[in-house]
Interface confidence: low
């Protein structure tokens, strides 16, 4: 299953398959999710060891049993792979590392006026992986505002340096934020020239081209048919970068097929996973496992379920059959690609599904990290989960946020619907960003149900949370993702990092902003809240978040929306935006609904009708 | 609310130096940048340098480089320019300004410099 | 350094008109640009700035457009009150610069 849990000042012994340096634990993590292998990793942040070479040291590693030993390392973080665990699963990172220098090859650098500025012209550049950007107090003047373009071999650091008045961080073309768009056509008889990056074996140029995607040198490809003249060549698929980004020549070639990596898309990239199934047709590989299984999508199912388990062979060998069942062979290989891809057997072959991040499991996310006032544009994909909340009667509005928890249910406040009980005049967008974006022919979902607390009453403060579940399941993209639920009984002092987010009133008197606005915000304590609102009770179901002096809030058209904070580099739903005196008014912080307190109610009404929850909170 | 208070104005004779300050209040004042920009008769506003008060790292116009030194007091939440060989072209209203994102979102009320022999 | 080169550097005009003051900016400043208001004795206030727009206090008659060196802040309907000196300022690299400056006059 899915294990998200870090360990902190633990370093797990043995089993590595591959080190690198990255700048934090997280990344540390998206890599060994990414990695063919790797089920484990430790990393050593620069505070937790003297060794200057293996300081930001990230190890991945693998073992047969699921787990190693883990020794007392002061400062290392260890935890799991995220394979197996949907929609968590994205190579999207979009933390800037500030007082940090990562290195590799300089091959651009020019002057911009922000970091920003120069994660944007890093995900603009095909070659770019990362960058780091000297500010304007950076103590040589004539590097001051440099924006350096990187990348290396590996798509990591050749090494992670602190530095003052240095920032750095990684490419958002993972992110489908790239500017630069993509190839999607195939050209069938053509072979591309230029460098290999790495040769591995695939049964079609679709598999091919989503390898090509997430590998990190990756540009373009050549594939060779499995009827291509030279047998050994065979289902290779070649892996190719230029220093133009694009092929400097193709060559007409029969059983040849070339195409580009997806990775500069925009708003879409290919699952990182392979979901075709092969019929007549084996995988050669490392064998984990051999069990008897009733039909070859039961196959599938046993190799994703079996973490180590990379693709299969299901055969229909009479040999290997006995009743309904024949023999699941699951196998596994150093890249993750089949050693050897045979033809005209009796066999069907396929692969893990462990990448796939529509997986229905824990609606836990840790990816982004009433105008809100004092906020600022977000950005594609920054907060996956919020979601518009309209009503068409003659003409439409947005009138609520809401946040997505599961493939079909919404969290919001209750008293949205006051006045507006009718599901038939909803309509929920997701997955958006400028209200402007949207036309009469944009896909919305509509209310199957709304559920609405029990002890809500109108005009009323307390219990203002509803669940809405939607007439059909959202899948999820790196748009459109849930968020993750406290724990039972979350004590929101642990939260430092919390942010409001909607599309509601700038000011007090304002109207309905067009780009999702964000603001960080500090959580204020419930006693502290209880002072400046004494004609109310705060309870402690309720969570209060502002600034002393006011300036930023949520407002008019927030309300329902998320307040999420980010805890070990996982972000939760806190609260729901409900109630305050005006907007950001100095001393008059914003009420919450605090949602940790609804959990069993949020639980108890998702079940779906085998009783089976449709959604849980973190371990 | 932010508020951003300069010291009264000055004259100075040519070849001195002035000492100008600024008063943050409103919000934290280490985690803002605090920038000098002056307004001269003939030249209109001209950015001279800024100063993060958290790291105390400054970045200079190149055009200023070597007279213009900016400091900061953060126990009293104060930014201070000091420009130093003073000239009659130096005559000009001095601001301190806080950026929002990057332009100036807060302005000090000015300080007039006169240099006057 | 880049140089912002503003024009009109003043102008007459009644209350009611229609106002537009250019800003060029001698190399592309990638929309890394800020209007601010001046009046007399009184420092700047910061009225637009890059591709959100307005600033909160101003009136939605202001507004600003233009790419790469080229930008115009445009009054649709010129009231008492913005009667002022109007700079443009280029925050996309140091040294930041700003436009000789716009008086608008009333006529």
């Known amino acids: 299953g899915c294990l998200t849990q870090l360990y902190e000042n633990a370093f797990f012994r043995g089993g590595d398959v591959a080190s690198m340096y990255t700048p934090n634990a997280q990344y540390c993590q998206m890599r060994c999710t990414f990695h063919p292998r790797c089920l484990l990793f430790s990393f050593l942040p620069a505070s937790s060891i003297n060794d200057m070479e293996k300081r930001f040291g990230c190890f991945l590693k693998d073992s047969v049993t699921g787990t190693l030993p883990k020794v007392h390392r002061t400062g290392a973080v260890s935890g799991h792979s995220l394979k197996q665990c949907g929609h968590q699963i994205s190579a999207c990172h979009r933390d800037i590392y500030k007082g940090v220098d990562m290195r590799g090859v300089n091959f651009n650098v020019s002057k911009v006026s922000s970091v920003e500025e120069c994660q944007k012209r890093c995900t603009s550049n095909i070659r770019c992986q990362f960058f780091s950007y000297a500010t304007q107090t950076f103590h040589k003047a004539e590097y001051r505002n440099n924006c350096l373009l990187k990348y290396s071999p590996g798509g990591t650091p050749t090494a992670i340096k602190v530095l003052s008045n240095v920032e750095s961080g990684f490419s958002l073309k993972p992110c489908a934020l790239s500017e630069i768009g993509c190839h999607m056509n195939i050209f069938q008889h053509l072979a591309f020239s230029d460098v290999d990056v790495a040769r591995v074996l695939t049964p079609d140029a679709f598999v091919c081209r989503t390898i090509c995607t997430y590998h990190p040198n990756c540009l373009f490809f050549t594939f060779y048919t499995n009827v291509w003249k030279i047998e050994s060549q065979r289902n290779v698929c070649l892996l190719k970068t230029s220093e133009s980004g694009t092929p400097s020549s193709s060559t007409p070639q029969e059983n040849t097929i070339s195409g580009y990596s997806l990775l500069t898309c925009k708003r879409t990239l290919p699952e990182p996973c392979h979901s075709k199934i092969y019929p007549g047709v084996d995988f050669g590989g490392e064998e984990l496992n051999v069990t008897f299984v009733k039909g070859v999508n039961v196959c599938q199912e046993t190799c994703t379920k079996m973490i180590r388990c990379q693709f299969f062979t299901y055969s229909l060998l009479p040999e290997d059959c006995k009743e309904e069942k024949c023999k699941c062979f699951l196998r596994l290989s150093m890249d993750g690609s089949p050693t050897r891809i045979a033809y005209g057997t009796q066999g069907s072959s396929g692969y893990s599904l462990r990448l796939c991040n529509t997986g229905d499991n824990s609606v836990c996310t840790t990816k982004t990290s009433t105008r809100i006032v004092g906020g600022t544009n977000s950005s594609w994909g920054e907060w996956p989960w919020q979601v518009s909340l309209q009503v068409k009667l003659t003409a439409q509005r947005h009138l609520c946020g809401g946040s997505l928890i599961g493939h079909q249910w919404v969290l919001t406040a209750a008293h949205c619907f006051d006045g507006l009980p009718l599901q038939d005049v909803w309509r929920i967008y997701s997955g958006i960003l400028n209200l402007s974006d949207i036309t009469k022919d944009t896909p919305f979902s509509q209310i199957k149900e709304i559920i609405i607390h029990q002890n809500y009453k109108v005009s009323e403060g307390n219990h203002d949370i509803a669940l809405i579940k939607l007439q059909a399941p959202l899948n999820y993209t790196e748009f459109q993702k849930p968020i993750c639920l406290p724990s039972k009984g979350d004590t929101s002092t642990i939260y430092t990092n919390c942010w409001v987010t909607g599309w509601g009133f700038s000011k007090e008197k304002g109207e309905i902003q067009n780009i999702l606005q964000k603001v960080n915000i500090p959580l204020v304590t419930n006693e502290e809240c209880q002072k400046r609102y004494q004609d109310y009770k705060i309870t402690q179901r309720m969570v209060c978040a502002g600034y002393k002096e006011g300036g930023k809030d949520a407002c008019k058209g927030d309300s329902g929306g998320p307040l999420v904070c980010k805890h070990n580099g996982m972000w939760r739903l806190v609260g729901i935006t409900s109630w305050g005196e005006g907007c950001a008014r100095r001393e008059q912080p914003g009420v919450y609904t605090k949602v940790a307190e609804y959990m069993d109610w949020i639980l108890e009404k998702t079940q779906s009708s085998d009783g089976k929850a449709q959604m849980q909170s973190p371990a | 609310q932010v508020q951003l208070v300069q010291s009264g104005a000055e004259v100075k004779k040519p070849g001195a130096s002035v000492k100008v300050s600024c008063k943050a209040s409103?919000?934290?004042?280490?985690?803002?940048?605090m920038h000098w920009v002056r307004q001269a008769p003939v030249q209109g506003l001209e950015w001279m340098g800024a100063?993060?008060?958290?790291?105390?790292?400054?970045a200079y116009n190149q055009k200023f480089k070597g007279r213009v030194t900016m400091t900061r007091d953060t126990s009293t939440s104060t930014v201070y320019m000091e420009l130093s060989s003073l000239r009659s072209e130096d005559t000009a209203v001095y601001y301190c300004?806080?950026?929002?994102?990057?332009?100036?979102?807060?302005w000090g009320q000015g300080t007039l410099v006169t240099v006057s022999s | 350094d880049i140089q912002m080169t503003q024009s009109p550097s003043s102008l007459s005009a009644s209350v009611g008109e229609r106002v537009t003051i250019t800003c060029k900016a001698s190399?592309?400043?990638?929309?890394?640009l800020a209007w601010y208001q001046q009046k007399p004795g009184k420092a700047p206030k910061l009225l637009l700035y890059?591709?959100?727009g307005l600033e909160a206090g101003f009136h939605l008659r202001f507004s600003g457009s233009g790419s790469g060196t080229h930008y115009t802040l445009t009054i649709s309907s010129l009231q008492p009150e913005d009667f002022a000196t109007y700079y443009c300022?280029?925050?996309?690299?140091?040294?930041?610069?700003f436009g000789q400056g716009t008086k608008v006059e009333i006529k």
């Open positions: 300004a806080r950026p929002y994102g990057y332009p100036f979102a807060y």
């Open positions: 409103g919000y934290t004042f280490t985690d803002y940048e």
């Open positions: 100063i993060h008060p958290g790291s105390g790292g400054t």
């Open positions: 190399e592309d400043i990638y929309n890394r």
């Open positions: 890059g591709e959100t």
């Open positions: 300022q280029q925050y996309w690299s140091t040294p930041w610069t």
